[in-house]
């Protein structure tokens, strides 16, 4: 039995692999940051884990997804605020026991060191400092991003 | 056309509580975070915190943490802000600000402002 | 806390000049400042965003620039209806702050 959670990150996971492939972006749009081959996009509002999820969505985007150690702290370093936590895109999945990526992946325990415990509708935020297991039904602010890496247009071969 | 309308003065002895309100018209009210912003006489602005009308969620300045409650009423697109043990040095004109982007901290519309003077 | 400085505090023009107000941070706050104008007994009015880009509706006389600390609001000709004061403000930070307000009248 999925969460109504899980089944929003899959609903968008299916969604965004119906849909054709646009050009890569080569540069951030307006108001977002660069950080390396990613746009990023802090939220100036709060709300629940699943609401921030959709939010992203209609930017033409997606929670943020962090692939290292590395890319944490330097996401890290771009928080002006101490206190401030912020939703990303990583659940923890009750039929598999585990933290998932929005994307469909699992987190590798080494990536990231969560404070807090993994059950059932817990989501992760993260802070300056640290990286937190909260309640997805916690209103706080989110950080959206865009990849920046262009997409080779596919080519067919001729019928 | 987007409006504001709050309600109307307030004189307050110190110690009491003043909850000011904010009735929104012309656009979706859930859609907007609103916010609250003050202006002591002759002086700059103050930001006090925000609301977001659809969940609820809040976040205050951590100035005011301890004395400030948002809420709102969906039902009749309303925002009210309560500041508790008032002081002489909250008397102030006290502004709803709508947000204008939930990724930018600039409000593009205002309240007519609800003037609250705290005097024993 | 983020402070914002404006100067001067009062500026006198006469119609028809050119009005420069300046705003300082007291840290980087890249692009992400406001500016408001405010007239008497009424509530500010949302003139630029990002520093340089002009609200819907704000006439084309009213141009903003700058990034990092420093800041300015011209209006390239004044006209009686921009007699006002005028606030900056930054976002880079969660705790929101304004500057304390240059006022422009009329010489």
């Known amino acids: 039995q999925k969460s109504s959670i899980e089944k929003c990150s899959v609903d968008i996971q299916q969604s965004r692999n119906k849909t054709t492939e646009r050009p890569g972006l080569l540069n951030c749009p307006i108001y977002w940051q660069q950080l390396r081959e990613k746009c990023l996009l802090f939220s100036h509002t709060v709300n629940p884990w699943n609401n921030s999820l959709a939010d992203c969505s209609t930017k033409e985007s997606s929670l943020l997804l962090i692939r290292d150690k590395d890319e944490l702290i330097h996401t890290q370093n771009l928080i002006r605020d101490k206190a401030i936590l912020f939703w990303i895109g990583l659940n923890f999945s009750l039929s598999e026991k585990n933290w998932k990526w929005i994307n469909g992946s699992f987190l590798n325990s080494n990536d990231l060191e969560i404070r807090g415990d993994a059950k059932e509708n817990s989501c992760i935020s993260i802070s300056q400092t640290s990286v937190y297991s909260e309640y997805c039904s916690t209103e706080i602010r989110w950080i959206c991003q865009k990849e920046l890496t262009p997409v080779r247009n596919k080519v067919y071969p001729d019928s | 056309q987007v409006q504001l309308v709050q309600s109307g003065a307030e004189v307050k002895k110190p110690g009491a509580s003043v909850k000011v309100s904010c009735k929104a018209s012309?656009?979706?009210?859930?859609?907007?975070?609103m916010n609250w912003v003050r202006q002591a006489p002759g002086q700059g602005l103050e930001w006090m915190g925000l609301i977001n009308p659809n969940t609820g969620g809040t976040y205050y300045n951590q100035k005011f943490k301890d004395r400030v409650t948002m809420t709102r009423d969906t039902s009749i697109s309303t925002a009210y802000m309560e500041l508790s043990r008032l002081r002489s040095d909250d008397t102030a004109v006290y502004y709803c600000a709508r947000l204008g982007d939930n990724y930018r901290g600039y409000f593009d519309s205002w309240g007519q402002g609800t003037t609250v003077t705290v005097s024993s | 806390e983020i402070v914002m400085t404006q100067s001067p505090a009062t500026l006198s023009v006469s119609p028809g000049e050119r009005a420069t107000l300046s705003c300082k941070a007291s840290?980087?706050?890249?692009?992400?400042v406001v500016w408001y104008q405010q007239k008497p007994g009424q509530a500010p009015r949302l003139l630029i965003d990002?520093?340089?880009i002009r609200h819907t509706g704000i006439p084309a006389r009213f141009s903003g620039s700058g990034s990092g600390t420093e800041f300015t609001l011209t209006i390239s000709s004044l006209q009686s209806e921009d007699f006002a004061v005028y606030y900056c403000?930054?976002?880079?930070?969660?705790?929101?702050?304004f500057g304390g307000g240059t006022k422009v009248e009329i010489k």
């Open positions: 403000q930054q976002y880079s930070t969660y705790l929101y702050t």
């Open positions: 990002w520093a340089s």
């Open positions: 840290q980087d706050v890249g692009t992400a």
């Open positions: 012309g656009y979706s009210f859930t859609g907007y975070t």
